[in-house]
């Protein structure tokens, strides 16, 4: 069942079928005998009760006030009253844009990230049984889609998908043809969730070591799920049996990004491990960033300013 009209301020376009449904509908069925009344007030008039005799365009059902169609002079405040329950709406009927298939003021904007799932489904549950056919237009050009009852677009978004999509439902009522238009302004943007990966700490690190001892070089980064972090050293990685790349550790941050750290363990440090670059690289679709570690013999520490050392 169609949900009730809970928004107190409503803007609609002239010439389209429209309805108001009060929010105590289930209650109204229980109290069949209770008097239920609909009123309108506008500028000059105060609380005029509505009934089918007020206008051939108005229909009253259990819970619903229907307009066939709504017109500019329907602008005003509407009230539903039942016992001690009252619901009020302010209705603003705006002029139709005769030069377009939609009215700019009645457009729903949606932002979709490129390559993310993008869907438009033309549905109107309230008028469903009366709808003969439905067409979907992009920038007022009809799209040829298989299903003419509920045309649908389901795809991964591309920049070319940007535009105004209008679902137009055609329906008959009392021998007259009406249409209802729902338009979406779809803006396709770049993937906003990606960050530029950041390697934490200084770009160049001199590490004081002793020959024959072990050292653990820790490389940490803040990155996206698909970004990679790896160590590069020597001519061909893996040629030195004393060098081991430990398993990467990843922790998700509250923002949905990843804090990654990868340790390079060098055992039984020899002369060949000194004064060479051990590079840690983070790679993403945006490119690469690298930080370097150089092992320096503790005895040589005096030759290098203290601030360039890491433990």
């Amino acid at each position: 069942a169609e949900s009730c009209t809970s928004r107190p301020h409503i803007t609609v376009v002239e010439g389209e079928p429209f309805y108001l449904k009060h929010c105590s509908c289930s209650l109204a069925h229980e109290i069949e005998t209770t008097t239920k009344s609909w009123y309108k007030s506008s500028g000059s008039q105060e609380h005029v009760e509505l009934n089918p005799r007020s206008s051939s365009r108005i229909a009253l059902h259990d819970c619903v006030l229907e307009f066939w169609p709504v017109e500019l002079n329907d602008t005003g405040s509407y009230f539903f009253q039942m016992k001690n329950y009252t619901q009020k709406w302010k209705l603003n009927v705006i002029r139709r844009n005769k030069h377009s298939c939609f009215t700019e003021r009645q457009v729903t904007s949606k932002i979709v990230e490129v390559k993310k799932f993008f869907q438009i489904t033309c549905e109107n549950s309230y008028y469903q049984t009366l709808v003969n056919s439905t067409s979907l237009y992009k920038n007022c050009k009809k799209l040829l889609l298989e299903n003419n009852k509920n045309p649908t677009i389901k795809k991964n978004a591309e920049f070319e998908d940007q535009g105004y999509y209008s679902c137009v439902h055609f329906l008959h009522h009392n021998g007259k043809l009406f249409n209802i238009t729902k338009t979406f302004n779809i803006t396709i943007v770049e993937d906003r969730s990606n960050i530029v990966p950041v390697l934490l700490g200084p770009k160049l690190n001199h590490v004081a070591v002793e020959l024959g001892k072990n050292v653990r070089l820790n490389c940490s980064a803040l990155l996206n799920e698909e970004d990679v972090i790896y160590w590069m050293f020597g001519e061909e990685n893996g040629s030195d049996p004393n060098i081991h790349e430990e398993k990467e550790m990843r922790i998700m941050t509250p923002e949905g990004k990843w804090h990654a750290s990868k340790v390079l363990r060098i055992e039984n440090i020899g002369e060949s491990n000194l004064n060479v670059l051990y590079n840690c690289t983070v790679a993403s679709t945006g490119g690469t960033d690298t930080k370097s570690f150089i092992l320096v013999r503790k005895a040589d520490m005096a030759d290098i300013p203290g601030h360039v050392f890491t433990r």
């Epitope: 990843r250 990654a260 993403s284 679709t285 490119g287 960033d289």
Partner: antibody
Framework: QVQLVQSGAEVKKPGASVKVSCKAS????????ISWVRQAPGQGLEWMGW????????DYAQKFQGRVTMTTDTSTSTAYMELRSLRSDDTAIYFC????????WGRGTLVTVSS | DIVMTQSPDSLAVSLGERATINCKSS????????????LAWYQQKPGQPPTLLIY???TRESGVPDRFSGGGSGTDFTLTISSLQAEDVAIYYC?????????FGQGTKLDIK
């Protein structure tokens, strides 16, 4: 419109240099690295290297190390690839492309090296 | 460097039939931290730049017909065209973007039988 527009064809003598440009539009230039890929006549695709637009870092294939320079100008969203000491076997179409899986390509620039 | 080897070098398939191209990497392109395969497939027609078909080994690029699918993991991958159309005649390349230098397979030429 999202596109990469490359500079026109070049004819060069052996030993000379060539600089190919690639202008990006329709997306945030710094969000994607720019790779250069070449294709010799009737041959396959060869990755030459790439530049990270956001920090200027470059990574070149060993084969081109010392002979290639990749740069960017963020004010004009343009990437450049300069190849020096040209030889006849450098005759190829040079493509710029973005990201690490290459979802957007330039049309290619034909560089002919001939004496 | 990671070496990418495609097989076969050329392939002829009847219209409407299935075409399968294989790609093998000399070392894994599967990143254990996120379980993603850093492998893409491209189609190249004469006189045109390549176009991306598949990335992450099996994710179809927007606008690519669903007759194209990618599979495999680690070192062995396949590109499948479920029902060959005339417009699919092209050269197909796999590429790894796990480690630089990013490398391509030698290409597989696909024709109609």
């Amino acid at each position: 419109q999202v596109q990469l527009v490359q500079s026109g064809a070049e004819v060069k003598k052996p030993g000379a240099s060539v600089k190919v440009s690639c202008k990006a539009s329709g997306y945030t230039f710094s969000s994607y690295g720019i790779s250069w890929v070449r294709q010799a006549p009737g041959q396959g695709l060869e990755w030459m290297g790439w530049i990270s637009v956001y920090n200027g870092n470059t990574d070149y294939a060993q084969k081109f190390q010392g002979r290639v320079t990749m740069t960017t100008d963020t004010s004009t969203s343009t990437a450049y690839m300069e190849l020096r000491s040209l030889r006849s076997d450098d005759t190829a179409i040079y493509f710029c492309t973005r990201g690490w899986y290459f979802d957007l390509w330039g049309r290619g620039t034909l560089v002919t090296v001939s004496s | 460097d990671i070496v990418m080897t495609q097989s076969p070098d050329s392939l002829a398939v009847s219209l409407g039939e299935r075409a399968t191209i294989n790609c093998k990497s000399s070392q894994t392109v599967l990143y254990s931290s996120n379980n993603k395969n850093y492998l893409a497939w491209y189609q190249q027609k004469p006189g045109q730049p390549p176009t991306l078909l598949i990335y992450w080994s099996s994710t179809r690029e927007s606008g690519v017909p669903d007759r194209f699918s990618g599979g495999g993991s680690g070192t062995d991958f396949t590109l499948t065209i479920s029902s060959l159309q005339a417009e699919d005649v092209a050269i197909y390349y796999c590429q790894q973007y796990y480690r630089t230098p990013y490398t391509f397979g030698q290409g597989t030429k696909l024709d109609i039988k």
